[in-house]
Amino acid sequence: TPEVWVQVRMEATELSSFTIRCGFLGSGSISLVTVSWGGPNGAGGTTLAVLHPERGIRQWAPARQARWETQSSISLILEGSGASSPCANTTFCCKFASFPEGSWEACGSLPPSSDPGLSAPPTPAPILRAD
């Protein structure tokens, strides 16, 4: 069964800036990635970015930069202030649609003891089953 991993990091330089990294562990070809916050996409979450391998990338505030890191992983930088600013316990979710396997989703938030700049390194990324 394919799996999705999610990693959330607060940037040391700006306390209101977050980096979300997500990856897909499966054999299918990815046809769409949807990043949301506040819960899963379609279940109370709000879409931050949609990445299509060929059609391109769409993003909505407070998303600042969404990009493909590899063919099977993406990153998203968020920055905001006031009402649109993420907080330390915000949940971020990534959904990967792959063909022919289908859609797979996982969610993550900032680790509880996360000091800016002291969050876990990119590898090994935490793997979260899509359940």
């Epitope: 069964t1 070809s29 899963p40 379609g42 063909f99 022919p100 396997e101 289908g102 859609s103 359940d131």
Partner: antibody, heavy 120, light 107 residues
């Protein structure tokens, strides 16, 4: 409103082929995968396969490899399934169903079905 | 392939009843379980996806639950329009597979 309109019932002879259609409206065909499902008379549902209308990629249930061929015509927003070398075992209702792209990997909208009867 | 089993092939209930239909997978499907109804005219509609999420437009009297291999669909306050055959489907692996169906009739 999302709708999948399938072609009408067909009666064919054993050994022949049949090609049925599924016209999508209310959304962009290339944005969602399309499944095809078989229901023999009074029985359960069997998954035949799936097509990605964006690039024509397909994946089939091993049981239907060589029996079914899935294609799309993007210009008319229509998906097709062709069944070949028909026998009485192929007599059934065939449904097209849109993949929702939800987690769960469900099929959120279904066509009304195309009835295929194979008889000499 | 993952086998989906609906042990009850038919059941009778009265209008206003609470009805539960069960479905078992031959292996853990991690909540990738969906429920459909098929009306007597052949129309098929999605009710519940990912074990418990209600599809848009589906009345709230329908609910789903379960985990691992065992799942159930509950209909509260049964209405006449709920008379149909109910199928479960797993979305965890290919090929997608369906349960044999549970036909719901009015007592």
């Amino acid at each position: 409103e999302v709708q999948l309109q399938q072609s009408g019932p067909v009666l064919v002879k054993p050994g022949a082929s049949v090609k049925m259609s599924c016209k999508a409206s209310g959304y962009r065909l290339t944005d969602y995968y399309m499944h095809w499902v078989k229901q023999s008379h009074g029985k359960s549902l069997e998954w035949i396969g799936i097509i990605n209308p964006y690039n024509g990629g397909t994946s089939y249930n091993q049981k239907f490899k060589g029996k079914a061929t899935l294609t799309v015509d993007k210009s008319s927003s229509t998906a097709y399934m062709e069944l070949n070398s028909l026998t009485s075992d192929d007599s059934a209702v065939y449904y097209c169903a849109r993949d929702s792209s939800n987690v769960g990997n469900d099929m959120d909208y279904w066509g009304q079905g195309t009835s295929v009867s194979v008889s000499s | 392939d993952i086998q989906m089993t609906q042990t009850t092939s038919s059941l009778s209930a009265s209008l206003g009843d609470r009805v539960t239909i069960s479905c078992r997978a031959s292996q853990d499907i991690s909540n990738y379980l969906n429920w459909y109804l098929q009306k007597p005219d052949g129309t098929v509609k999605l009710l519940i996806y990912y074990s418990s999420r209600l599809h848009s437009g589906v009345p709230s009297r329908f609910s789903g639950s379960g985990s691992g291999t065992d799942y159930s669909l509950t209909i509260n306050n049964l209405e006449q329009e709920d008379i149909a055959t109910y199928f479960c489907q797993q979305g965890n692996t290919l090929p997608r597979t369906f349960g044999g169906g549970t036909k719901l009739e009015i007592r």
